[in-house]
């Protein structure tokens, strides 16, 4: 969480950003809020990126002004027009690329004053893992698969029965580069599993953490997956 203030004494407003993570190949959100103004026409929103000459996006007088927009952001950015009046200056970014990572500045002008805050935008790939019984294996095994990760994550297995156990000796993890030569498919196999136990496959990089659980009993198999972005830490 980053809170910025204007630099002109009493003519300053609070602008707040969140460290954000973008999943490459999807639309992303760069989060920014500010003290609202009652008149939309008095609000100016400028998004800038460190190392980029042109603007990322500009909104003023109640509408987009893309005349000074940098080429790399053409056709890709939008603010939530109907939410600007209530202090939402967040930016939507179409088709996030690895190169979109960096430091952005959300700069706001209203009738109350000016303010800005920086935002660290991380880009990578993350996806839900799916854990299944691996019927190809000679012994009872579990196979954990996740189609897209970047940077290369760590994979850790855990079990409800053997809490604290280290499964690195009885598991094998591989990373297969996907066709666009950036993201990778993650496959991890856990050997010698026992029934009446719940196993968890945890995949994590500096952007996201995902977990795939499987409960194996004599009568049924239950699965559950979750994904958590590691994007709200204080800068």
């Amino acid at each position: 969480l980053i809170i910025g203030f204007g630099i002109s004494g009493r003519h300053s407003i609070t602008v707040t950003t969140l460290t954000s993570a973008g999943n490459i190949g999807e639309d992303g959100i760069l989060s920014c809020t500010f003290e609202p103004d009652i008149r939309l026409s008095d609000i100016v929103i400028q998004w800038l990126k460190e190392g980029v000459v042109g603007l990322v996006h500009e909104f003023k007088e109640g509408k987009d002004d893309l005349s000074d927009q940098d080429e790399m952001f053409r056709g890709r950015t939008a603010v939530f027009t109907d939410q600007v009046i209530v202090g939402n200056a967040s930016l939507r970014l179409k088709n996030v690329q690895l190169t979109d990572a960096g430091t952005y500045k959300c700069y706001i002008i209203t009738s109350k004053g000016k303010g800005n805050a920086n935002l660290e935008y991380k880009t990578g790939a993350f996806s839900m893992p799916e854990v299944n019984l691996d019927y190809n294996a000679s012994s009872e095994s579990l196979r954990c698969e996740a189609p897209r990760w970047f940077p290369q994550p760590t994979v850790v297995w855990a079990s409800q029965v053997d809490q604290g156990a280290n499964f690195s000796e009885v598991s094998n993890t591989s990373f297969e580069l996907n066709s666009e030569n950036v993201t990778m498919k993650v496959v991890s196999v856990l050997y010698n599993v026992t029934v009446n136990n719940t196993y968890s496959c945890m995949i994590e990089n500096d952007i996201a953490k995902a977990t795939g659980d499987i409960k194996v009993t004599d009568s049924e198999i239950k699965r559950r997956s979750s994904l958590q972005l590691l994007n709200s830490r204080a800068a």
Partner: antibody
Framework: EVQLVESGGGLIQPGGSLRLSCAAS????????MNWVRQAPGKGLEWVSV???????YYADSVKGRVTISRDNSKNTLYLQMNSLRAEDTAVYYC?????????WGQGTTVTVSS | EIVLTQSPGTLSLSPGERATLSCRAS???????LAWYQQKPGQAPRLLIY???SRATGIPDRFSGSGSGTDFTLTISRLEPEDFAVYYC??????????FGQGTKLEIK
């Protein structure tokens, strides 16, 4: 050269199924937003479906539950599986790449649904 | 759902004249996500303008786009014989994910 080539269209009976293909060259399908857009005879353009680089998919209400967009990254090819076809699905189907907008289009493949 | 309404439905002009085509959205559309396409009979559409005002690669400078919010315009400053076609505006980013206008037919007077 950046190019898209559709195939798989034809005459099909109502209720039938068809799979359209779109072979890409000069760029990677899995790095882009890839769309299917259709045009009924004498009518305007209608968006059908998109698959994001991440694999996330979206569909127009008119086809939801009846069509599936997918891709084969190894073949650099986009697909549209169409089931429970109706007369109103008769159209030229185009695949299109969306970067900043739909900048690359195929030549289209014609689907005719008729008994 | 965002509806794009194009006007006029048909525009009859002569070569050398100026053409002004309108696209009105039922609610605000980001300028970045507004595009214009040209389609000739028997051909696939061709991207002309993206980001409301940026010309696509290879598009002559007689084509220009403008507007923001709910009102967008495609202008062809001096019509050439090859410009007579159907023109579509299109938006991205709302449900449905993409929407096209119904088209404006530009015909020779």
């Amino acid at each position: 050269e950046v190019q898209l080539v559709e195939s798989g269209g034809g005459l099909i009976q109502p209720g039938g199924s068809l799979r359209l293909s779109c072979a890409a060259s000069g760029f990677t399908v899995s790095s882009n937003y890839m769309n299917w857009v259709r045009q009924a005879p004498g009518k305007g353009l209608e968006w059908v479906s998109v698959i994001y680089g991440s694999g996330r998919t979206y569909y127009a209400d008119s086809v939801k539950g009846r069509v599936t967009i997918s891709r084969d990254n190894s073949k650099n090819t986009l697909y549209l599986q169409m089931n429970s076809l109706r007369a109103e699905d008769t159209a030229v189907y185009y695949c299109a790449r969306d970067t900043y907008a739909m900048d690359v289009w195929g030549q289209g493949t014609t689907v005719t649904v008729s008994s | 759902e965002i509806v794009l309404t194009q006007s006029p439905g048909t525009l009859s002009l002569s070569p050398g004249e100026r053409a002004t085509l309108s696209c009105r959205a039922s609610q605000s559309v980001s300028s970045s996500y507004l595009a214009w396409y040209q389609q000739k009979p028997g051909q696939a559409p061709r991207l002309l303008i993206y980001g409301a005002s940026s010309r696509a690669t290879g598009i002559p400078d007689r084509f220009s786009g403008s507007g923001s919010g709910t009102d967008f315009t495609l202008t062809i400053s001096r019509l050439e014989p090859e410009d007579f076609a159907v023109y579509y505006c299109q938006q991205y980013g709302s449900s449905p994910m993409y929407t096209f206008g119904q088209g404006t037919k530009l015909e020779i007077k």
